[in-house]
């Protein structure tokens, strides 16, 4: 019917059981297992009152039957500028959930691709308004993943104040546009995060110690664009002790070659940087100046490309992008489709792998999955994967700790908290803790061997080109060495 | 209730046109993406055509491209698909549907309107 | 273009048992965690109706014995227990992206 709107959780894909806690003690006399979850001691500073706080939200969300039982949801604020809008000429907004006794500020950046001409933009509209108009937004979200507020499933920062702020504006967070004859649509992305940013000072922002901008996808490019002018922003407000960070989830893709090349018609199988090139001029979008002074006008593009844009950065940013990302391979047009694949497919699949682990090896804080997925951080089962024995939620804590101890000049990490995560196995989901499989016909989860054999994936002669037994060769591939 | 009619089908001899309209009530029409899919006899359904909600972009598909013609008038709440050089093809039950803009799901359908091509 | 191929063409189940229709797409058509696969009925002489919207969210009105599942490229429909007024012909379709299409259609028969 009219204006029906399916609010689902993100990623779909069913996850294995939970990984057990990280840190765990036996309750007295029972030989039974408690959960211990780290308070959020950067935010209490000799400050009694927010340190009790945290203690009462703690208490609370370990005590189910609690009157005060905790509210996962966060509250939709529209923009009080109503002149910073979403495609449509709607208000712009975000999603709040306040919390008084932390002084860590996470606000996430909404994926989910971008149209680059009045033509996709006509059909985006139609078909997926909701990332073009706040006008049927409802008026609360749940946080999940890196968003929730209950230790178990953010164990990494469950007691900060989370924002959501939806991608309504299709130009990669990039845009600066406003609406002219010429545009029947706007393109605000950069603008609105500058106005999120500006309204939540009045919110409790101003106090913060830390903002962490995060995203996925589009998102996680959005970061990328604009971590930089977010810091400076502040600095220029008068708030230069706000600590600004990037966390990219999922939004560094690469101008490689397209497995087959495909003219620019639509926005999934256009190849990125055409795609890019053209909507820049589109949406009037904007990249950060110490990038786009390294290439001549016309070749902001590059910009977009984490690999490219990321030397060029003053704040920290911890980059989270699965080695097999299924947006890059659509946009590659190698996307698995279940089909068995021909052997150049999965020449081009492993190499890109490859290539990917190439441009994170100078990223010192990184977690790049052997998996085929696409993102991550706000799944509720974001906790489950690891790379090397570490989780992500494990990882941006050392991340935190390196940056607290005043590490980020050394190259020397901190003892025992890995934070340059990259898997070197070379097959998708190769790594046995990647998100479950599942043949997608019987719904029964398949093991890796399983994966591969079922997408056409010839033992024999891998294990001859490796020089190995394939029994051997399965065997590593079920371990995931 | 929200409803869509098509009307304009007939016998129509090759080489010849045709206009078929779609008149919808009972929402606010100028909020949809329109569509029109066809169904030769005994054959499956086949995607014609798109009209974005402004009117601004038309869509079509190979088969039909450079032969049809799609507008909307906003105002008057109709959908019209002008077919020229008409083909032994092109005989088929033509609907009418909407798409949904929360995933472009075509949730309200017309009762179609049948065209032969035939001399 | 998005091509969907729909299988079987055909298929005869018992009445209460479950009747399973696949289809696959010739590239993903899931995006920022929606996967853009449409499931309709038709029955003879009159217009399809839809079922299931967005892989796997049910239209209202539609009977719980249908449901759907799948992301990425491989998509199901499930229909369970069968009923005799289920006999019908099922269509899949894709919105990802233009231009939109469909599947050849599965004709189920209630033996």
């Known amino acids: 019917g009219e204006g029906r709107k399916t609010w689902r959780r993100r990623g779909q894909q069913p996850a294995p059981a939970p990984l057990p806690p990280q840190r765990t003690e036996a309750a007295p006399g029972t030989g039974q297992p408690v959960e211990s979850f780290p308070l959020d001691f950067t935010a209490v500073e000799g400050n009694m009152d927010s340190f009790m706080a945290q203690v009462k939200s703690l208490a609370q969300s370990l005590y189910p039957c609690s009157a005060q039982q905790l509210n996962e949801d966060l509250r939709l604020h529209l923009l009080l500028n109503t002149s910073v809008t979403c495609n449509d000429g709607s208000p712009a907004g975000y999603y709040l959930k306040e919390s008084k006794g932390s002084r860590r500020w996470l606000l996430f950046l909404e994926g989910g691709w971008y149209c680059f001409s009045r033509e996709n933009c006509d059909s985006r509209y139609d078909t997926m308004r909701r990332l073009m108009s706040s006008k049927d937004w409802p008026q609360t979200r749940t946080g999940t993943g890196i968003l929730s507020s209950q230790p178990e499933e953010n164990p990494y920062w469950w007691n900060a104040n989370m924002v959501f702020i939806p991608y309504c504006s299709s130009d990669v967070w990039s845009g600066a546009s406003s609406k002219s004859e010429k545009n029947e649509y706007v393109f605000m992305g950069a603008l609105i995060i500058r106005e999120v940013v500006q309204e939540l000072l009045g919110r409790g922002l101003s106090g913060a110690k830390v903002l962490l901008l995060a995203g996925s996808s589009a998102g996680g490019t959005g970061v990328l664009l604009n971590v930089d002018r977010v810091a400076e922003q502040l600095e220029q407000l008068g708030y230069p002790a706000i600590q600004v960070r990037g966390l990219a989830d999922s939004g560094w893709f690469l101008d490689n070659k397209q497995y087959r090349r495909t003219d620019c018609v639509d926005t999934v199988t256009c190849a990125p940087t055409e795609a890019i090139r053209r909507g820049i001029r589109y949406w009037n979008g904007m990249v950060p100046e110490r990038c786009r002074s390294q290439f001549k006008e016309g070749e902001e593009w590059n910009c977009f490309l984490g690999y490219k844009v990321y030397p060029t950065l003053r704040c920290p940013v911890f980059v989270v992008q699965w080695l097999f990302d299924e947006a890059q391979l659509t946009a590659d047009n190698a996307h698995l489709t279940g089909q068995p694949v021909q052997e150049g497919q999965w020449l081009y699949i492993q190499n890109l792998g490859h290539e990917l682990r190439n441009t994170l090896k100078d990223v010192p804080a990184s977690f790049a999955p052997a998996c085929l997925s696409h993102e991550i951080i706000i799944r509720s089962h974001w906790t489950d994967v690891q790379v090397k024995g570490t989780s992500l939620p494990r990882a941006l804590h050392c991340w935190d700790r390196s940056l607290h101890d005043s590490h980020k000049a050394s190259k020397t990490p901190l003892k025992g908290c890995p934070i340059h995560l990259v898997d070197s196995c070379p097959w998708p989901h190769c790594n046995p803790s990647c998100p479950t499989i599942r043949d997608q016909f019987t719904g029964q989860e398949m093991n890796v061997a399983q994966f591969l054999m079922h997408m056409g994936f010839d033992v024999q002669t891998v294990a001859q080109q490796q020089g190995l037994e394939p029994s051997k060769l399965l065997g590593m591939l079920s371990s995931g060495s | 209730d929200v409803q869509l009619l098509e009307s304009g089908g007939g016998l129509v001899q090759p080489g010849g046109s045709r206009k078929l309209s779609c008149a919808a009530s009972g929402f606010t029409f100028s909020d949809f993406g329109m569509h029109w899919v066809r169904q030769a006899p005994e054959k499956g359904l086949e995607w014609v055509a798109y009209?974005?909600?402004?009117?601004?972009?038309?869509y079509y598909a190979d088969t039909v491209k450079g032969r049809l013609t799609l507008s909307r008038d906003n105002s008057k709440n109709t959908l019209f698909l002008e077919m020229t050089s008409l083909r032994s093809e092109d005989t088929a039950m033509y609907y009418c549907?909407?798409?949904?803009?929360?995933?472009?799901?075509?949730?309200?359908w017309g009762q179609g309107t049948s065209l032969t091509v035939s001399s | 273009d998005i091509v969907l191929t729909q299988s079987p063409a055909s298929l005869a189940v018992s009445l209460g048992q479950r009747a399973t229709i696949s289809c696959r797409a010739s590239?993903?058509?899931?995006?920022?965690?929606?996967?853009?696969i449409h499931w309709y009925q038709q029955k003879p002489g009159q217009p399809p109706k839809l079922l299931i919207y967005l892989a796997s969210d049910l239209e209202s009105g539609v009977p719980a014995r249908f449901s759907g599942s799948g992301s990425g490229a491989a998509f199901t429909l499930n229909i369970h227990p069968v009923e005799e007024e289920d006999a019908a012909t099922y269509y899949c379709h894709h919105s990802r992206e233009l231009p939109f299409t469909f599947g050849s259609g599965t004709k189920l028969e209630i033996k």
């Open positions: 009209s974005s909600s402004g009117g601004t972009t038309v």
């Open positions: 590239k993903s058509v899931s995006t920022s965690g929606y996967s853009y």
């Open positions: 549907a909407r798409a949904s803009y929360d995933g472009g799901y075509f949730d309200c």
